[in-house]
């Protein structure tokens, strides 16, 4: 397993729709064909999945159909957007890449993006 | 080093507006909130808000909200608040800080705004 | 909103003291999201401890940060004549982020 830099920002506010999106960069020694991209949110201590996809260098990340994640990737770029965000859902944002093939496997883990989230206002009751 | 840069000292009258600029420098400014916290003579410090330097997404304080714009200027690495009808007890020393997620880190030297007749 | 609060408002000592300033949030905030800021007349704040223990770059050792959930304390182990100013604590785990009203350090 071999180190590999990567970069995200260090704050985002989400939309006040519940959706965020950011750029994970990672600097690839070599020409990777299979990127594994994985989200962890970190929150009190406890680091849990968020979602996680392989991709083809050129291809569309795929992500599960009930991931809470879309992504695409450009290079060695991932934008990485993440819906249905509450307030509660505020926290650190680790993008984790791993270079899969062709060997050697490489490994980065970024600082982590601080994602805010704030619940919309109720919509005021309104008679039609 | 990291610095932000605040524009001079600013005389109103009530009903004006009033726009402080915020010139960051040593850091990238997209990867970073710019928040405004204000301090009223004699007071503590006010949380007005902040804007996500990287998405230009904003969250007023609910007292300011509808007076109140933040922007960036990533191209200048400036960020901009701008206070409407201003009133007398809007009177206070306005200060940009560097958001990073776990505090503040980096402030800069303040501006002081005056409403007077 | 996270109301902050924090006690006493004034503390008077001595240099050489011990000062133990307290912070309470309205409802529970992550240690993560607590910071604690200095400021003396006529100059902005500074950051002094975020994650509720972590000392900001450059700050000396007898500052210190304790706490979690509700109550956060600030301790500067032995005051020195700079250390007399005005202590804040803030929450940036809910938005909007909010400061207590501060606690002045004085001399006795």
């Known amino acids: 397993c071999k180190a590999m830099h990567v970069a995200q920002p260090a704050v985002v506010l989400a939309s006040s729709r519940g959706i965020a999106s950011f750029v994970c960069e990672y600097a690839s020694p070599g020409k990777a064909t299979e990127v594994r991209v994985t989200v962890l949110r970190q929150a009190d201590s406890q680091v849990t999945e968020v979602c996680a996809a392989t991709y083809m260098m050129g291809n569309e990340l795929t992500f599960l159909d009930d991931s809470i994640c879309t992504g695409t990737s450009s290079g060695n770029q991932v934008n990485l957007t993440i819906q249905g965000l509450r307030a509660m859902d505020t926290g650190l944002y680790i993008c984790k890449v791993e270079l899969m093939y062709p060997p050697p496997y490489y490994l980065g883990i970024g600082n982590g993006t601080q994602i805010y989230v704030i619940d919309p206002e109720p919509c005021p009751d309104s008679d039609f | 080093q990291v610095q932000l840069v605040q524009s001079g000292a600013e005389v109103k009258k009530p009903g004006a507006s009033v726009k402080v600029s915020c010139k960051a420098s040593g850091y990238t400014f997209t990867s970073y909130g710019i928040g405004w916290v204000r301090q009223a003579p004699g007071q503590g410090l006010e949380w007005m808000g902040w804007?996500?330097?990287?998405?230009?997404?904003?969250n007023y304080a609910q007292k300011l909200q509808g007076r109140v714009t933040m922007t960036t200027d990533t191209s200048t690495s400036t960020a901009y608040m701008e206070l409407r009808s201003l009133r007398s007890d809007d009177t206070a020393v306005y200060y940009c800080?560097?958001?990073?997620?776990?505090?503040?880190?980096?402030w800069g030297q303040g501006t002081t705004v005056t409403v007077s007749s | 909103e996270i109301v902050m609060t924090q006690s006493p408002a004034t503390l008077s000592l001595s240099p050489g003291e011990r000062a133990t300033l307290s912070c309470r949030a309205s409802q529970s905030v992550s240690s993560s999201y607590l910071s604690w800021y200095q400021q003396k007349p006529g100059q902005a704040p500074r950051l002094l401890i975020y994650?509720?223990?972590t000392r900001a770059t450059g700050i000396p050792a007898r500052f210190s940060g304790s706490g979690s959930g509700t109550d956060f304390t600030l301790t500067i182990s032995s005051l020195q004549p700079e250390d007399f100013a005005v202590y804040y604590c803030?929450?940036?785990?809910?938005?909007?982020?909010?400061f207590g009203p501060g606690t002045k350090v004085d001399i006795k």
């Open positions: 804007i996500s330097a990287y998405n230009g997404n904003t």
């Open positions: 994650g509720a223990s």
């Open positions: 800080a560097r958001v990073r997620g776990g505090g503040v880190d980096v």
């Open positions: 803030q929450q940036d785990y809910n938005l909007p982020f909010t």
